[in-house]
């Protein structure tokens, strides 16, 4: 999937299986990514687990879990708030669009999470105070989480190089781990560009991600995924000058 | 291995709530040098871990991108502390502790928010 980190780095990661997205003293978010096509290096998020940890007089521990074709508007125990404590309403789930869009407000840690199902796959967005991001006591075991550190260098796909080369032939092969996977017909480059331009008129990294995804999969739903990801940034990002990211940021500390 | 503490201190120093060091300021290079020193001080106990190697490569990249010299001043991280997670000894009838922004305003002006997103393939 494409990742925008807390430090506004933008990466395309081929991480497969379960990976920690956020892991601090208050919250744990884990994603499971699966290959979008057999043999492809490109992966997308098929499962998301969020654990809100027990916090003072506010909330009991609550677990939220979403999977492909299952975007519940409740925690796994069936509740929609933080439990029986005095400040239980400081954690709330709201269904925005049934089966497609859920918002979780965790006011006790100043955090808003948006989970969507777009096509077969899930998207995730969060707004979180810096000091909550940094509230990690045990650096060893709460370690390498993707939102803070980005994905490891050996798990990154240089999709901008892909974008540059994609006008030529073999676009899908560039995104594959091995020889080109058998897949439904993907779009010609011009069609992908046109479809992405419709939804994402600014040629930023979200637009480029959209083009990459269409060329890689042929699945038009990924256009919407990029579009909603940008919409979520508009809602959640505190710095309105940083809504759009462009190529020049690609070499920021993706490995640090 | 304390390498992630180094990462966090660097992150805090370069995106703190007061005057964050922008990519092109001397403060950014100072923060990078602090980061480099911090990682070197963890080298022996982190040397086999991915986090350490990621940090070292990242620092090298950023040093060259921003033309930072290896020698020069270093910076101190800015950190504030949240109340501890888990059950509190003090039972409070007031839900103010359960509203981050309200309790934050008591200590400082406004929290500095960050964003992370994951989508597509």
């Amino acid at each position: 999937p494409h990742l925008r980190t807390f430090t506004d780095r933008f990466q395309t990661c081929k991480v497969q299986g379960a990976w920690p997205l956020i892991d601090n003293n208050y919250l744990n978010v884990q994603v499971t990514n699966t290959p979008v096509l057999p043999g492809s290096a490109a992966t997308a998020t098929s499962k998301l687990t969020i654990i809100f940890k027990n916090f003072q007089e506010c909330v009991d521990q609550k677990v939220y879990q979403a999977e492909m074709d299952e975007l519940p508007a409740a925690f796994v125990d069936g509740s929609k708030n933080g439990g029986d404590k005095h400040g239980a309403n400081s954690l709330k789930i709201t269904e925005k669009v049934s089966g497609q869009h859920v918002e979780i407000q965790a006011k006790y840690i100043g955090t808003t999470i948006v989970v969507r199902q777009v096509g077969r796959y899930l998207t995730f967005a969060v707004r979180m105070p810096e000091e909550v991001v940094n509230a990690v006591e045990d650096w060893d075991s709460q370690g390498l989480y993707l939102c803070l550190r980005g994905c490891p260098l050996n798990q990154q796909i240089d999709f901008q190089a892909f974008h540059t080369n994609a006008e030529g032939t073999g676009a899908r092969r560039l995104a594959a781990a091995s020889p080109a996977p058998t897949a439904p017909e993907t779009f010609p480059y011009e069609t992908a560009v046109a479809k992405c331009k419709e939804k994402l008129p600014v040629e930023d990294l979200y637009y480029q991600a959209c083009v990459f995804d269409l060329l890689t999969t042929g699945d038009v739903n990924f256009t919407l995924a990029a579009y909603y990801a940008l919409e979520d940034v508009k809602m959640l990002h505190s710095n309105k000058d940083k809504l759009h990211l462009y190529e020049r940021t690609r070499d920021l500390p993706g490995r640090a | 291995c304390k390498i992630l503490k180094c990462n966090s201190e660097f992150w805090s120093a370069t995106s703190g709530s007061h005057a964050p060091a922008s990519d092109d300021t001397p403060e950014f290079c100072a923060a990078l040098r602090s980061y480099a020193l911090c990682t070197r001080r963890t080298a022996r106990t982190c040397r086999g871990d991915l986090a350490y190697h990621s940090a070292v490569h990242g620092i090298e990249d950023l040093m060259s991108q921003h033309n930072c010299s290896k020698d020069g001043p270093t910076s101190q991280p800015r950190l504030r502390t949240l109340p501890p997670a888990g059950d509190s000894q003090e039972r409070s009838d007031s839900p103010e502790i359960c509203h981050y922004e309200k309790s934050f305003h008591k200590h400082s002006a406004t929290p500095n928010y960050t964003h992370c997103g994951l989508f597509g393939d």
């Epitope: 990976w19 920690p20 060893d140 075991s141 370690g143 390498l144 490891p152 050996n154 | 291995c1 304390k2 020193l37 070197r40 001080r41 963890t42 080298a43 022996r44 106990t45 982190c46 040397r47 086999g48 871990d49 991915l50 986090a51 350490y52 190697h53």
Partner: antibody, heavy 115, light 112 residues
Framework: EVQLVESGGGLVQPGGSLRLSCAAS????????MNWVRQAPGKGLEWIGM????????HYADSVKGRFTISRDNSKNTLYLQMNSLRAEDTAVYYC????????WGQGTMVTVSS | DVVLTQSPLSLPVTLGQPASISCRSS???????????LEWFQQRPGQSPRLLIY???SRFSGVPDRFSGSGSGTDFTLKISRVEAEDVGVYYC?????????FGQGTKLEIK
Amino acid sequence: EVQLVESGGGLVQPGGSLRLSCAASGFTFSNYGMNWVRQAPGKGLEWIGMIYYDSSEKHYADSVKGRFTISRDNSKNTLYLQMNSLRAEDTAVYYCAKGSTPDYWGQGTMVTVSS
Amino acid sequence: DVVLTQSPLSLPVTLGQPASISCRSSQSLEDSDGGTFLEWFQQRPGQSPRLLIYDVSSRFSGVPDRFSGSGSGTDFTLKISRVEAEDVGVYYCFQATHDPLSFGQGTKLEIK
């Protein structure tokens, strides 16, 4: 919860070989250096060696250099210790431990070298 | 190779009383960048070793605050402010500054 489970120990004759395995769970195995440490019966701990997260470097104690080889398979979350030219003094409980310096340890597997 | 020498080798302590274990290194454990990589491990009878202290004085996750580490250069100390029954076992210092890494010979703590 971090879990490390060693296996493959047993009785072997001097000069023989044995391969120990360490199955890891509860953490992202491929992110961490790993160590092997041993403890002879009634004795103290002896560091054997370590391997980097990506197998790019390995370091060994002088007592096992050239005889023991540490390897790993990150796709299987498993660490290995191949022991050749075994001697009586290699008799010990062998532990694997997570991290570039050991933090979490397995329960150990006993290796007895005897004729 | 670095040799770590612990003393005493046996330490009988009364419950609730403090205990102190020394670890001396044959060469300085401070590296050129100012890092000092000395750890302390506890091994209870019949159990695997457990990390208590790393980087001289940092307590590992879940370790009670009655354990503390201090020292620099070649001299290091592990202190237990009030010994409890569960503290019985062998304590090892361990250095990671120089290859090959090495352990002290161990100090056996027992209850008087």
